[in-house]
């Protein structure tokens, strides 16, 4: 049971990419406001986004404290202008979110090719190590810092003059591939966490091609 003229939130959904994590829900409020609480399975509830008319709440600051923990959130509904009002059970109406484990569930953001350098018949392709909002010792960790060897990159590459693609993998952020001399190549990368069963892959990076600004060519 809940407060008269308030409705419980529903469709609570976690939206998370590279640990930037937002809880979304419905409905758009009419004469009501929301407050969100978040907790680990064993921890205390912490309130966020107090008395908001938004239908989303950024919980990044809470989940980055320990991305391997499992979190639960709940959204409380209050009548607008009367937030002290409670239901007959003595507490406001609320709805629980699904459980969320950031390390296992955050989506991998679209990677970016930082650079490529050709030396003779080898090309070194470097993937940008994207910064996350996860902190350790007051510094922000990169995606590689957080996932370590759990994160691999798949490189797709092809001659500019042909559509036949090849692929290679790395568990660092660098590839060293063989190419044909005198040919221009295009590159795209995808981030993958092979040990996951869902949300294993990112979208592909933008395509970068030799002969454009990003790379460097050295004939040895």
């Amino acid at each position: 049971s809940g407060t008269t003229n308030t409705v419980a939130a529903y469709n609570l959904t976690w939206k998370s990419t590279n640990f930037k994590t937002i809880l979304e829900w419905e409905p758009k409020p009419v004469n009501q406001v929301y407050t969100v609480q978040i907790s680990t399975k064993s921890g205390d509830w912490k309130s966020k986004c107090f008395y908001t008319t938004d239908t989303e709440c950024d919980l990044t600051d809470e989940i980055v404290k320990d991305v391997k923990q499992t979190y639960l959130a709940r959204v409380f509904s209050y009548p607008a202008g009367n937030v002290e009002s409670t239901g007959s059970a003595g507490e406001p109406l609320y709805e629980n979110s699904p459980e969320f484990t950031p390390y296992l569930e955050t989506n991998l953001g679209q990677p970016t090719i930082q650079s490529f350098e050709q030396v003779g018949t080898k090309v070194n392709v470097t993937v940008e190590d994207e910064r996350t909002l996860v902190r350790r010792n007051n510094t922000f960790l990169s995606l590689r810092d957080v996932f370590g060897k759990d994160l691999i990159y798949t490189l797709y590459y092809w001659k500019s003059s042909s559509s036949g693609k090849k692929t290679a993998k790395t568990n660092t952020n660098e590839f060293l591939i063989d190419v044909d001399k005198g040919e221009n190549y295009c590159f795209s990368v995808q981030a993958v966490i092979p040990s996951r069963t869902v949300n294993r892959k990112s979208t592909d990076s933008p395509v970068e091609c030799m002969g454009q600004e990003k790379g460097e060519f050295r004939e040895i």
């Epitope: 797709y156 693609k165 090849k166 993998k169 063989d178 092979p194 040990s195 869902v198 294993r200 892959k201």
Partner: antibody, heavy 117, light 107 residues
Framework: QIQLVQSGPEVVKPGASVRVSCKGS????????IYWVRQSPAKGLEWIGY????????IYDQNFRAKATLSVDHSTSNAYMEINSLRYEDTAVYFC??????????WGQGTSVTVSS | DIQMTQSPASISASVGERVTITCLGS??????LAWYLQKPGRSPQLLIY???QLADGVPSRFSASGSGTDFSLTISSLQPEDVATYYC?????????FGQGNKLEIK
């Protein structure tokens, strides 16, 4: 449990085409690449290519680029390989397999394709 | 393209014996190597991934080592059910080539 179930055996004439299907179940179909491999007594295991159901991207061994076409149907969790311009030496057992941590963890039961006039 | 060469092509060993087969890559592939076994009339079955990691359900008598270009698979105590053909596979870069196989028989 995770399964890949392939279509039944085929006997086809030289020059014809054949389509082999591979139905995935028990897992999130778009999250894992589907690889295709063939096996014949003469050449052993040959890697044909793979398709990433997530984005439709295909990678082929250059020897099969003009021979095989890979596709998926998300609505039925089916992967397909069409082999065209069949020759006697294309007689083989064709396998689909699902990737995991840099390997092929689950395999279909194989589809025998016999090219015979 | 990376070629994978396995040796010996066939092995005959006694039950309880220690058996080692090797796989040599024509270029370095770090630890991106897989081992499979295949019994007659069956699909290949994953034994080892990432050069050294046992796949789920694989008995502990199997072990593997190597990185770069040189890899090996060892059965510490051969069992009758280990009769099969063993294949290595480059899973580093396409084409993801297989070795030609090692056929293992019981003496």
């Amino acid at each position: 449990q995770i399964q890949l179930v392939q279509s039944g055996p085929e006997v086809v004439k030289p020059g014809a085409s054949v389509r082999v299907s591979c139905k995935g179940s028990g897992y999130s179909f778009t999250d894992y690449n589907i690889y295709w491999v063939r096996q014949s007594p003469a050449k052993g295991l040959e890697w044909i290519g793979y398709i990433d159901p997530y984005n439709g991207l295909t990678i082929y061994d250059q020897n099969f680029r003009a021979k095989a076409t890979l596709s998926v149907d998300h609505s039925t969790s089916n992967a397909y390989m069409e082999i065209n311009s069949l020759r006697y030496e294309d007689t083989a057992v064709y396998f689909c397999a699902r990737d995991v941590t840099s390997a092929l963890e689950f395999w279909g039961q194989g589809t025998s394709v016999t090219v015979s006039s | 393209d990376i070629q994978m060469t396995q040796s010996p092509a066939s092995i005959s060993a006694s039950v309880g014996e220690r058996v080692t087969i090797t796989c040599l890559g024509s270029q370095t592939i770090d630890t991106y190597l897989a081992w499979y076994l295949q019994k007659p009339g069956r699909s290949p079955q994953l034994l080892i991934y990432a050069a050294t990691q046992l796949a789920d359900g694989v008995p502990s008598r199997f072990s593997a080592s190597g990185s770069g270009t040189d890899f090996s698979l060892t059965i510490s105590s051969l069992q009758p059910e280990d009769v099969a053909t063993y294949y290595c596979q480059n899973v580093y870069s396409s084409p993801f080539t297989f070795g030609q196989g090692n056929k293992l028989e019981i003496k």
